[in-house]
Interface confidence: low
């Protein structure tokens, strides 16, 4: 397997780095690649055999404030005739991302990074059959 | 930035928008949750649009390991195990936020970075272009 590059995550003389209290880090929320856009195949959420809907969750104390979550439309999958086939299962595909959470404690504000699980879409799978003895 | 509602009894000193630079607690909430999709489910094998998972590793990034999905087939797998090329396996992509050290030289200073990952694949009906 490819040797991972360690590259240039160097130290620096303390005087040229921002002073950071123990247990904290300085975070620049100006996002690198901010204008990158997803170029997925058109309307795959409705064309999929395991179609899904999108719901936008909004939280003003989270950055980014909008997180889009997918929900599978059916328990089964859509067959060639356009009917739901319950011998197959529509299941969610999930991915972790980081969000920045803003917490208010009285008049003081603190920030914490949080790993959140986003449902990205759905896929059609063969079910796991459990045989009863 | 995003608008933040403020406690009306607090001094009106902070910008209502999310600040460009913040000090953040190092303890990432939910940091220990599983990041290996192979361990969390076997959908990548059981799907009608199966995919392989490739380990994308970058020690300069947090999280340092991200799994990238690559669809195994152009078509979708039928019940008999054969591939149906009348249907298409397509990747489901998602933008995620990761941490990148910036300035590069400072051990406690980071910037958010948006990256595009393929999370899995789904089986879709193809878009048919009719030639006039």
């Amino acid at each position: 397997r490819k040797i991972p590059k360690v590259g240039h995550t160097f130290f620096q003389k303390p005087e040229s780095c921002p002073p950071v209290p123990e247990g904290s880090m300085k975070l620049d929320t100006g996002i690198i690649n901010e204008n990158q856009r997803v170029s997925m195949s058109r309307n795959i959420e409705s064309r999929s055999t395991s179609p899904w809907n999108y719901t936008v969750t909004w939280d003003p104390n989270r950055y980014p404030s909008e997180v889009v979550q997918a929900q599978c439309k059916h328990l089964g999958c859509i067959n060639a005739q356009g009917k739901e086939d319950i011998s197959m299962n529509s299941v969610p595909i999930q991915q972790e991302t980081l969000v920045l959470r803003r917490k208010h404690q009285g008049c003081s504000v603190s920030f914490q990074l949080e790993k959140v699980l986003v449902t990205v879409g759905c896929t059609c799978v063969t079910p796991v059959v459990h045989h009863v003895q | 930035g995003i608008a933040i509602p403020r406690n009306s009894g607090c001094p009106n000193s902070e910008d209502k928008n999310f600040p460009r630079t913040v000090m953040v607690n190092l303890n990432i909430h939910n940091r220990n949750t599983s990041t290996n999709p192979k361990r969390s489910s076997d959908y990548y094998n059981r799907s009608t649009s199966p995919w392989n998972l490739h380990r994308n590793e970058d020690p300069e990034r947090y999280p340092s390991v991200i799994w990238e999905a690559k669809c195994r087939h152009l078509g979708c797998v039928k019940a008999d195990g054969n591939v149906d090329y009348h249907m298409n396996s397509v990747p489901i992509q998602q933008e995620i936020l990761v941490l990148r050290r910036e300035p590069r030289h400072c051990p406690n200073s980071f910037r958010l970075e948006k990256i595009l990952v393929s999370v899995g694949c789904t089986c879709v009906t193809p878009i048919v272009h009719h030639v006039a």
Partner: antibody, heavy 122, light 107 residues
Framework: QVQLVESGGGLVKPGGSLRLSCAAS????????MTWIRQAPGKGLEWISY????????YYADSVKGRFTISRDNAQNSLYLQMNSLRAEDTAVYYC???????????????WGQGTTVTVSS | AIQLTQSPSSLSASVGDRVTITCRAS??????LAWYQQKPGKAPKLLIY???SLESGVPSRLSGSGSGTDFTLTISSLQPEDFATYYC?????????FGGGTKVEIK
């Protein structure tokens, strides 16, 4: 101040096992990558393994892969190295060291312990 | 793995001398190189990182230079506390590797 104290070294027969420990203090242990580096008598330094802050990301040098296991207990501020199938060539002073970066590895080491000696001999 | 070759393996010098140690990488590593000092019975101490940046608290008579495959550690005026063994370390890729060391002895 930052302190790293290794323990668990000793004399062991070839094929035997040892577990080294490294007790950390003076910094937030759970935020830092940690590493083990060894030095054979009269020889240079050899990096053998590192572990990420949460323990989810681990590397080994080829010379110890499959025989040594690095682990950590963030609640106890402790780093460990389980050494199995020991060979004469594993005889060395074993140092635990702190990676200088927070959250992300820098792969350089700003604090080192004083080392613990492992001797593999029949 | 990237090999680091240090030369000389040992040298004798007097207090006040200018001393130069070289480290050559088997392939280009940009400036991803660190230098450590080790005294007998002690743990190594980080001196220089990023090929030329001095770690906090390290005296300015020590300096580093180089990029790609050839690197140099220079002590402009050798002091009694500088007699030790010096190691280079690359952090360009895993496995991390160290040079074989250069022992600086009193003439």
């Amino acid at each position: 101040q930052v302190q790293l104290v290794e323990s668990g070294g000793g004399l062991v027969k070839p094929g035997g096992s040892l577990r080294l420990s490294c007790a950390a203090s003076g910094f937030t242990f759970s935020n830092y990558y940690m590493t083990w580096i060894r030095q054979a008598p009269g020889k240079g330094l050899e990096w053998i393994s590192y572990i990420s802050s949460t323990g989810g990301n681990i590397y080994y040098a080829d010379s110890v892969k499959g025989r040594f296991t690095i682990s950590r207990d963030n609640a106890q501020n402790s780093l460990y190295l389980q050494m199995n199938s020991l060979r004469a060539e594993d005889t060395a002073v074993y140092y635990c060291a702190r990676d200088g970066g927070v959250i992300i590895s820098t792969a350089m080491f700003d604090y080192w312990g004083q080392g613990t000696t492992v001797t593999v001999s029949s | 793995a990237i090999q680091l070759t240090q030369s000389p393996s040992s040298l004798s010098a007097s207090v006040g001398d200018r001393v130069t140690i070289t480290c050559r990488a088997s392939q280009g590593i940009s400036s991803a190189l660190a230098w450590y000092q080790q005294k007998p019975g002690k743990a190594p101490k980080l001196l220089i990182y990023d090929a030329s940046s001095l770690e906090s608290g390290v005296p300015s008579r020590l300096s580093g230079s180089g990029s790609g495959t050839d690197f140099t550690l220079t002590i402009s005026s050798l002091q009694p506390e500088d007699f030790a063994t010096y190691y280079c370390q690359q952090f360009n890729s895993y496995p991390l590797t160290f040079g074989g060391g250069t022992k600086v002895e009193i003439k």
